[in-house]
């Protein structure tokens, strides 16, 4: 008799999930010498242990602590780039400005980026059919809890000037319900972080509005100021040109020396 399986509203675990995590871990540790000491099999065992045989709506940050410990990584705390709803551009930026780090440039973020996973209560099986949706099913699911945990730790580690890339094409440029708005903003440490600098990325070619005056940006400024952190905001009107100039600042159309 086939066992009854809970049907969740979200997509199931990414196919070849164990192999993908292990392969990503090996690749990352090979090209990042400071992480060469990491044993990828142990990382996978700790990752698996966080959600296998557990109810996928009852996952806690505690479940991920063994993985967090194995994936402990020091990044330059003054070179952190947070992002919200504009992941691709943030990643393109840290590819051309390699001294800056998004969460996905760290081992744990790299392992889980764009993947979905969940298990089932009391069985060692991975559920490839469906996983809980954050809105429709439950918020304490394996994926959401993972990102909440690593995002909190990443924000807590930040110092000096912290940068955040925001999507100026969205109706809510700053969204209180995003990971940035609900987790990272509240875990920046005022005793370490001097300024949060928002980069608002424009979508339209002819868009010359000052999106730093947007009500949601003012809301972000208010939240940050109340936490005794300074706030600054800059418009990036042409993201394509911006990336090009970051790569080659000596181009005559780009230069502004300090």
């Amino acid at each position: 008799v086939p066992r009854w399986r809970q049907q969740w509203s979200g997509p199931g675990t990414t196919k070849r999930f164990p192999e993908t995590v292990l392969a990503r871990c090996v690749k990352y540790t090979e090209i990042h010498p400071e992480m060469r000491h990491v044993d990828c099999q142990s990382v996978w065992d700790a990752f698996k242990g966080a959600f296998i045989s557990k109810h996928p709506c009852n996952i806690t940050e505690e479940d991920y602590q063994p993985l967090m410990k194995l994936g402990t990584q020091t990044v330059p705390c003054n070179k952190i780039l947070l992002w919200s709803r504009i992941k691709d551009l943030a990643h393109q930026f840290t590819q051309v400005q390699r001294d800056m780090f998004t969460l996905e440039d760290t081992l744990l973020g790299y392992l889980a980026d764009d993947l979905t996973w969940c298990g089932e209560f009391n069985t060692s099986k991975i559920n490839y059919q469906s996983c809980p949706d954050w809105r429709k099913d439950c918020s304490n699911n394996p994926v959401s809890v993972f990102w909440k945990t690593v995002s909190r730790r990443f924000a807590e580690a930040a110092c000096d000037v912290v940068h955040v890339m925001l999507n100026g094409s969205r109706s809510k440029i700053f969204d209180k319900n995003s990971t940035f708005g609900s987790v990272e903003v509240h875990n920046l440490q005022p005793e370490k972080v001097q300024t949060l600098e928002a980069w608002v990325i424009h979508g339209g070619r002819e868009d010359s509005r000052d999106l730093c005056q947007d009500p949601t940006i003012k809301e972000l400024e208010s939240i940050i100021s109340k936490r005794n952190i300074q706030f600054s905001c800059k418009n990036i009107y042409r993201p394509d040109k911006f990336l090009q100039c970051v790569k080659n600042p000596e181009d005559s159309s780009c230069t502004s020396e300090i």
Epitope: E34, T74, D99, K234, Y237, T255, I258
Partner: antibody, heavy 127, light 108 residues
Framework: EVQLLESGGGLVQPGGSLRLSCTGF????????MSWVRQAPGKGLEWVAD????????YYADSVKGRFTISRDNSANTLYVQMNSLRAEDTAVYYC????????????????????WGQGTTVTVSS | QSVLTQTPSVSGTPGQRVTISCSGI??????VSWYQQLPGTAPKLLIF???QRLSGVPDRFSGSGSGTSASLAISGLQSEDEADYYC???????????FGGGTKLTVL
């Protein structure tokens, strides 16, 4: 013209002290991270120390840690290095250098290079 | 603190192309820069961010990098290129500058 001018070098006995100065011209000194680099006679370049634009972060080579102090006076556009407990192996030409930074569409970025160098000042430690 | 490794000397005739290598870069996120030091003068920046030429530097000078090594190529060698060349990298994890030992270029 962007320029750095060092001064303060000279002959000093082992165990003695010396303070070198470097004044910047032609750029916004307050915005610039600065470094000291030295070159012993007939040898290669050796980094000595680095300081952030407002002086709140300082970094040192192991060989000078605890003996040298890098500092700056932004109101005078001047960088300093205070050298104490000097040794014969500190004999070198000392250069100050500006860290390369650029503003790309109002965003300030560090390019991890030294784009302006002073002419150097000679320090000789000998009895 | 580690030192980057450079070939101590290279030579070439006018018009030739020479390459200077730099190895021992600890991390793929560290950028390499290249400096020219003419006899009796201060160093001068040629290349930053692995392969970006500083404005005013002739395009005969080019930099390249792949992971843990980098190189400086000089094509169409000229007598005035005779100098010492240094690679350097700022280690973003340790907050230290690391220099190569230098390469003496002789134009025969």
């Amino acid at each position: 013209e962007v320029q750095l001018l060092e001064s303060g070098g000279g002959l000093v006995q082992p165990g003695g002290s010396l303070r070198l100065s470097c004044t910047g011209f032609g750029f916004t000194f307050t915005d610039a991270r600065m470094s000291w680099v030295r070159q012993a006679p007939g040898k290669g370049l050796e980094w000595v120390a680095d300081i952030s634009s407002y002086g709140d972060n300082t970094y040192y080579a192991d060989s000078v840690k605890g003996r040298f102090t890098i500092s700056r006076d932004n109101s005078a556009n001047t960088l300093y290095v205070q050298m104490n407990s000097l040794r014969a192996e500190d004999t070198a030409v000392y250069y100050c250098a500006k860290r390369m930074e650029r503003e790309v569409m109002t965003i300030k970025l560090d390019y991890h290079a030294m784009d302006v160098w002073g002419q150097g000042t000679t320090v000789t430690v000998s009895s | 603190q580690s030192v980057l490794t450079q070939t101590p000397s290279v030579s070439g005739t006018p018009g030739q192309r020479v390459t200077i290598s730099c190895s021992g870069i600890f991390n793929i996120r560290n950028y390499v820069s290249w400096y020219q030091q003419l006899p009796g003068t201060a160093p001068k920046l040629l290349i930053f961010k692995d392969d970006q030429r500083l404005s005013g530097v002739p395009d005969r000078f080019s930099g390249s990098g792949s992971g843990t090594s980098a190189s400086l190529a000089i094509s169409g060698l000229q007598s005035e290129d005779e100098a010492d060349y240094y690679c350097a990298a700022w280690d973003i994890f340790l907050n230290v500058w690391v220099f190569g030992g230098g390469t003496k270029l002789t134009v025969l």
